[in-house]
C-alpha cells in the first residue's frame, strides 16, 4: 500500500541518574543510542497494525518508547494502556519526521503490558503495538568460575556458566598477602578467558554480571614458602573440577616436581608441568594436579614433592553438598558507652558464603577474611554503640546460617518523672536495669533522707518496647505525703539519678533533676 507511512519504532534506555527523563509522556532529551524495534506490519489484522519487537525491561529501569513517522502533513495521536487513554504530544524532528514518545519511569509490574498508539495522519489511520514486560531476573544466575586446561596448550580457560553471559577477568598478583588486595597497585587485571602466564604468586579468576561478582582462586602450594602451621584444606563438591598448582623456584633447572595422592603417584593425564626462567636466571617450575570431575575417592592428602625442596601437602575433601559450619547459639554482650567492640563469627564454609549484617532492619556489607586454620571470620564493628539485636546471615548454594547477637550498652540511669492526682511515676532507660528508692523531703529531712516504702510499685521491664528497656516505679499518693516534695532515685552499677517531685495537685509539675554519679 503506497499510502502507508514509513514508520520506525525505537527503545531508548535511560541511566537511572538521568535527570533528563521527564514525568510526562512527551519526549525527553536523550543521549543514549536508541535500539530499533522493527515495527513490522501485523498480518491478518483488521486495519493497519504495526507491531514492535517485544521489550524486556529491568525492574526500576526507565525507558522511552518512541515512534518516528515519515508521512506528509500533521499527525494526531493517542496512547492507550490497560483501557486508559494517555496524553500524546507529537512533535517534528530536524528531518521533519513526526516523533511520538512514551516515557516509563522506574518500571514496575503495574507498568508492564500492551501499549497501543493510535496515529491519525492526513493520509491514513494506523495502530502501533508495543508489548513491555519485566525482565525475569529469576532466571539469572551467577556461578563461581572454574578452570579447564586449554586443548593442546599450556594455558587455563576460566569458565562461568552464568546468565546473562558474564564478563570474565583474571586477577593476578606477584606480591604476598595484604598487598594482593583488589585495589592494590600490585594487582593486574586481564579481561580475557584464557590465561597463559601461570607463574604468578596469586591467580584468581572472576566473573561478573548483573547479579554481582564471583571469584575462584587457583589453589597453590609454594614450596619456597614456610608451610602453614595447619595443613591447607581444599573443599570441592562431587562433580566439580580439581585444580592444585605446585610452584617451586630453584637456582638452576636441576630439579623436578611430582604429585602424589595418599603416597601414590598421580596418573598421567592428571597433571602437567610448565617452567620458565625468572629475571634473575633462577628456574620456576609449576606442576598442576587436576581432575576434570571429582568423585568421593578423590578425597585425600595431595603431596607435592621436589628433589630440591621439602615436600608440602594439602587435604582435599570432596563433599556431596555445600555447608556452613559455625555455632549458631545467640550471644549477648554488655559494653560500656565508649568501649571498642566488634561482633565476630568464625565459620568454615564451602562454597564461599555471601553474608550480611543486619541491625534495625538495615543491612550492612559483610567482609570475610580467611584464617590460616581453614576457618574464615567476619567481623562487624559499625554498631555505633546502639543497643539492640544484630543478625549475621550467611548463605551459599546449599546452606544457610543465621546467628543473633544482642548488644546492651551500660549506662547510668536517666530519670524522667510524671505525676497525676493519685500517683507519681518515674521512668528510666538505664542499663543494667536500675533499682528504685523513694524519699520524702520535709523539715525533719531537708536532705530528703526519709525513705518511703508504703505505696511504692516497682517494675523492671519484662521486655523491650521499640528496642528500649524501660524500668519504672510508681508511688501511690497518700495523705501522709500530699503537699511534700518527694525524690525518686534510680541506681545501677554505673551511678544514680534522681528527680524531685512536688506532690500537690494534678497538672504540670516542677521537676528537679539530680545527677548523682
Amino acid at each position: 500500500n503506497q499510502d502507508l507511512p514509513v514508520i520506525k519504532c525505537v527503545l531508548i534506555n535511560h541511566k537511572n541518574n538521568d535527570s533528563s527523563v521527564g514525568k510526562s509522556s512527551s519526549y525527553p532529551m536523550v543521549s543514549e543510542s536508541p535500539e530499533d524495534l522493527g515495527c513490522a506490519l501485523r498480518p491478518q489484522s483488521s486495519g493497519t497494525v504495526y507491531e514492535a519487537a517485544a521489550v524486556e525491561v529491568d525492574v526500576s529501569a526507565s525507558i522511552t518508547l518512541q515512534v518516528l513517522v515519515d508521512a506528509p502533513g500533521n499527525i494526531s495521536c493517542l496512547w492507550v494502556f490497560k483501557h486508559s487513554s494517555l496524553n500524546c504530544q507529537p512533535h517534528f524532528d530536524l528531518q521533519n519526521r513526526g516523533v511520538v514518545s512514551m516515557v516509563i519511569l522506574k518500571m514496575t509490574e503495574t507498568q508492564a503490558g500492551e501499549y497501543l498508539l493510535f496515529i491519525q495522519s492526513e493520509a491514513t489511520n494506523y495502530t502501533i503495538l508495543f508489548t513491555v514486560s519485566i525482565r525475569n531476573t529469576l532466571l539469572y544466575t551467577l556461578r563461581r568460575p572454574y578452570f579447564r586446561k586449554m586443548e593442546n596448550q599450556d594455558a587455563l580457560v576460566c569458565i562461568s556458566e552464568s546468565v546473562p553471559e558474564p564478563i570474565v577477568e583474571w586477577v593476578l598478583c606477584d606480591s604476598q598477602g595484604e598487598s594482593c588486595k583488589e585495589e592494590s597497585p600490585a594487582v593486574v587485571k586481564k579481561e580475557e578467558k584464557v590465561l597463559h602466564e601461570l607463574f604468578g604468586t596469586d591467580i584468581r579468576c572472576c566473573a561478573r554480571n548483573e547479579l554481582g561478582r564471583e571469584c575462584t582462586r587457583l589453589f597453590t602450594i609454594d614450596l619456597n614458602q614456610t608451610p602453614q602451621t595447619t595443613l591447607p584444606q581444599l573443599f570441592l563438591k562431587v562433580g566439580e573440577p580439581l585444580w592444585i598448582r605446585c610452584k617451586a623456584v630453584h637456582v638452576n633447572h636441576g630439579f623436578g616436581l611430582t604429585w602424589e595422592l595418599e603416597n601414590k603417584a598421580l596418573e598421567e593425564g592428571n597433571y602437567f608441568e610448565m617452567s620458565t626462567y625468572s629475571t634473575n636466571r633462577t628456574m620456576i617450575r609449576i606442576l598442576f594436579a587436576f581432575v576434570s570431575s571429582v568423585a568421593r575417592n578423590d578425597t585425600g592428602y595431595y603431596t607435592c614433592s621436589s628433589s630440591k625442596h621439602p615436600s608440602q601437602s594439602a587435604l582435599v575433601t570432596i563433599v556431596e553438598k555445600g555447608f556452613i559450619n559455625a555455632t549458631n547459639s545467640s550471644e549477648d554482650y554488655e559494653i560500656d558507652q565508649y568501649e571498642e567492640f566488634c561482633f565476630s563469627v568464625r565459620f568454615k564454609a564451602y562454597p564461599q558464603i555471601r553474608c550480611t549484617w543486619t541491625f534495625s532492619r538495615k543491612s550492612f556489607p559483610c567482609e570475610q577474611k580467611g584464617l590460616d586454620n581453614g576457618y574464615s571470620i567476619s567481623k562487624f564493628c559499625n554498631h555505633k554503640h546502639q543497643p539492640g539485636e544484630y543478625i549475621f546471615h550467611a548463605e551459599n548454594d546449599d546452606a544457610q546460617f543465621t546467628k543473633m547477637f544482642t548488644l546492651n550498652i551500660r549506662r547510668k540511669p536517666q530519670v524522667l518523672a510524671e505525676a497525676s492526682a493519685s500517683q507519681a511515676s518515674c521512668f528510666s532507660d538505664g542499663y543494667p536495669l536500675p533499682s528504685w528508692t523513694w524519699k520524702k523531703c520535709s523539715d525533719k529531712s531537708p536532705n530528703c533522707t526519709e525513705e518511703i516504702t508504703e505505696g511504692v510499685w516497682n517494675r523492671k521491664a519484662n521486655r523491650k518496647v521499640f528496642g528500649q528497656w524501660v524500668s519504672s516505679s510508681t508511688l501511690n499518693m497518700s495523705e501522709a505525703i500530699k503537699g511534700f516534695l518527694v525524690k525518686c532515685c534510680a541506681y545501677n552499677s554505673l551511678g544514680t539519678s534522681c528527680e524531685t517531685i512536688l506532690l500537690n495537685s494534678p497538672g504540670p509539675f516542677p521537676f528537679i533533676q539530680d545527677n548523682i554519679s
Epitope: 497525676s420 511515676s425 521512668f427 521499640f466 510508681t474
Partner: antibody, heavy 123, light 108 residues
C-alpha cells in the same frame, strides 16, 4: 481508663502528606507506648510504628521507613503520625493504640484504641 | 519479620457452639508475646488476650487463649450473639509487630 481521641477524616491528593493526631485523657500519658496501626478498606490490621513519649524514642516498620514520622508532645498528651508521599493504596483507617509501660499498667497488648481516622487518597 | 497465618479464614457456627481459632507464626514468638483482638464492623479492635493466655480486663471467661512457640489458639467456649466478629492475632515480641490476616466468625 485512658481514652484516645483522634483527629477527623482527611481527603488528600497523591504525593501529598497527612498528619493525624491522637490525644490521650484520663491517665498518665508518659506511662504508655503509643503505636499506630492502619486498616485498608476490607483488609486486616497493619502495624506502622510507635513511640515511647517519655523517652521520645520512635520505631517504624520497614515498609513505612522514610515515609512515616511519629512524634509525641507530653505537655498536651498528644501523639502524631505523619505519612508523606501519599498514594492511593494509603487509603485506610488509621488508629492509634496504647500499651502500658509503667506503674500498675500492663506492658502488653493494646488495651485502648482511638476511634480511627479515615484518610482517603484520591486525585 | 514474623508472619502470622490465621486459620480458618471464615468460621460458620451457631450461638452456643464452641469456636477454635488458630494462629501460626513463621518463627517462634519470644516469651509468648501474642495478643488476640476482636473487631466489629465500623469499630476499633478490642483486646481480648495478651501474653498468649491472659484475659484482658473485663473480658468474659468464655474467651481463653493457649499456645507457645509458633502455635497459638483462641477458644470461645460458647458463642454468644455479640461474639460474631473478626478476630486478629498479633505478636509483639519482636519488631515489626505483626498481625494475622484475621478469622471471621459468622452466624451459620
Amino acid at each position: 481508663q485512658v481514652q484516645l481521641v483522634q483527629s477527623g477524616a482527611e481527603v488528600k491528593k497523591p504525593g501529598s502528606s497527612v498528619k493525624v493526631s491522637c490525644k490521650a485523657s484520663g491517665g498518665t500519658f508518659s506511662s504508655y507506648a503509643v503505636s499506630w496501626v492502619r486498616q485498608a478498606p476490607g483488609q486486616g490490621l497493619e502495624w506502622m510504628g510507635g513511640i515511647i513519649p517519655i523517652f521520645g524514642i520512635a520505631n517504624y516498620a520497614q515498609k513505612f521507613q522514610g515515609r512515616v514520622t511519629i512524634t509525641a508532645d507530653t505537655s498536651t498528651s498528644t501523639a502524631y503520625m505523619e505519612l508523606s508521599s501519599l498514594r492511593s493504596e494509603d487509603t485506610a483507617v488509621y488508629y492509634c493504640a496504647i500499651e502500658g509501660i509503667g506503674g500498675d499498667l500492663r506492658y502488653e497488648g493494646y488495651d485502648a484504641w482511638g476511634q480511627g481516622t479515615l484518610v482517603t487518597v484520591s486525585s | 519479620e514474623i508472619v502470622l497465618t490465621q486459620s480458618p479464614g471464615t468460621l460458620s457456627l451457631s450461638p452456643g457452639e464452641r469456636a477454635t481459632l488458630s494462629c501460626r507464626a513463621s518463627q517462634s514468638v519470644s516469651h509468648s508475646y501474642l495478643a488476640w483482638y476482636q473487631q466489629k464492623p465500623g469499630q476499633a479492635p478490642r483486646l481480648l488476650i495478651y501474653g498468649a493466655s491472659f484475659r484482658a480486663a473485663g473480658i468474659p471467661d468464655r474467651f481463653s487463649g493457649s499456645g507457645s512457640g509458633t502455635d497459638f489458639t483462641l477458644t470461645i467456649s460458647r458463642l454468644e450473639p455479640e461474639d460474631f466478629a473478626v478476630y486478629y492475632c498479633q505478636q509483639y515480641g519482636s519488631e515489626p509487630y505483626t498481625f494475622g490476616q484475621g478469622t471471621k466468625v459468622e452466624i451459620k
